[in-house]
Amino acid sequence: KAMHVAQPAVVLASSRGIASFVCEYASPGKATEVRVTVLRQADSQVTEVCAATYMMGNELTFLDDSICTGTSSGNQVNLTIQGLRAMDTGLYICKVELMYPPPYYLGIGNGTQIYVIDPEPCPDSD
């Protein structure tokens, strides 16, 4: 009955500080409403990065000020996190909750290590 969530082990953010990864879950039930949360784990502290609830077949809607965007297709969610800096390097965990109809199910991935490298400033041209 437990829900399995799969996500890539490692992702390298682009030079513009954008990282994308797929979060896939094996649904044990016929959920119509799903909540996806991205958590960041650093030094055993877990914080919420962003979250969205969506109806199956509809698009994910994150809050306007969220650093996350995403699309869904079946039991797969494509997540994009933007505005990342080198200090944001860390483990990003995909958490999936099947909210409705009951029963509720929780699934937590093993995390994606996102590496962010700040771009080198362009040298001054003479």
Epitope: A2, L39, Y104, L106, I108
Partner: antibody, heavy 122, light 107 residues
């Protein structure tokens, strides 16, 4: 300091016909209450823990144990940082200490209140 | 509903000894399992989540292991304050369920 404080427990007489009612409250402080799902868990005297009800952060999703479905109603007021449990048609078997508990980001119940005693006597 | 069975019901040990508590699920709960400690007259306290991750502020003498249906809580060297009742809980699906508890008492 992260804290949950329950109140509203007491003695209720189980009458012939529909039982009595009681409303429990749980005041939260020290964290962003509106970001967390919350639960009620109870413990009958000398017994183990039994989950009663759960409510999502925005009250959109609510779940009940079969033993209380149709009799108990969970609710919350994020503006007041408060969680509630309205208990109707109380029975002797509802006698227990009632705890409110926060659902941590990783799923377990990470913060608990000290509990409030509800006694239903015939 | 997921049924969690804890064993033994009571464990009689002396301070300094090792305690091994078991929790068995009726079907797989993956690693969505937590352990709680409860002392008389107090609320439960989260010790372990995700089967093996210690909660904030929990001493390293407490450790958890297992996945699927069989889980273990180990207390390496019992301190006087560790004598209490321990509950396991699955939180992977509703209804959320607890084991019946294991009492660790002073021998």
């Amino acid at each position: 300091e992260v804290q949950l404080v329950e109140s509203g427990g007491g003695l209720v007489k189980e009458l012939l016909g529909p039982g009595g009612s009681l409303r429990l409250s749980c005041a939260a402080s020290g964290f962003t209450f509106s970001s967390y799902s919350m639960n009620w868990v109870r413990q009958a005297p000398g017994k183990g823990l039994e989950w009663v009800s759960s409510i999502s952060s925005s009250s959109s999703y609510i779940y009940y144990a079969d033993s209380v479905k149709g009799r108990f109603t969970i609710s919350r007021d994020n503006a007041k940082n408060s969680l509630y449990l309205q208990m109707n048609s109380l029975r002797a078997e509802d006698t227990a200490v009632y705890y409110c508990a926060r659902v941590g980001l990783m799923g377990p119940f990470d913060i608990w209140g000290q509990g409030t005693m509800v006694t239903v006597s015939s | 509903n997921e049924v969690l069975t804890q064993s033994p019901g009571t464990l009689s040990l002396s301070p300094g000894e090792r305690a091994t508590l078991s929790c068995r699920a009726s079907q797989s709960v993956s690693r969505y399992l937590g352990w709680y400690q409860q002392k008389p007259g107090q609320a439960p306290r989260l010790l372990i989540y995700g089967a093996s991750t210690r909660a904030t502020g929990i001493p390293d003498r407490f450790s958890g292991s297992g996945s699927g249906t069989d889980f273990t809580l180990t207390i390496t060297r019992l301190e006087p304050e560790d004598f209490a009742v321990y509950y396991c809980q699955q939180y992977g699906s509703s209804p959320w369920t607890f084991g019946q508890g294991t009492k660790v008492e002073i021998k």
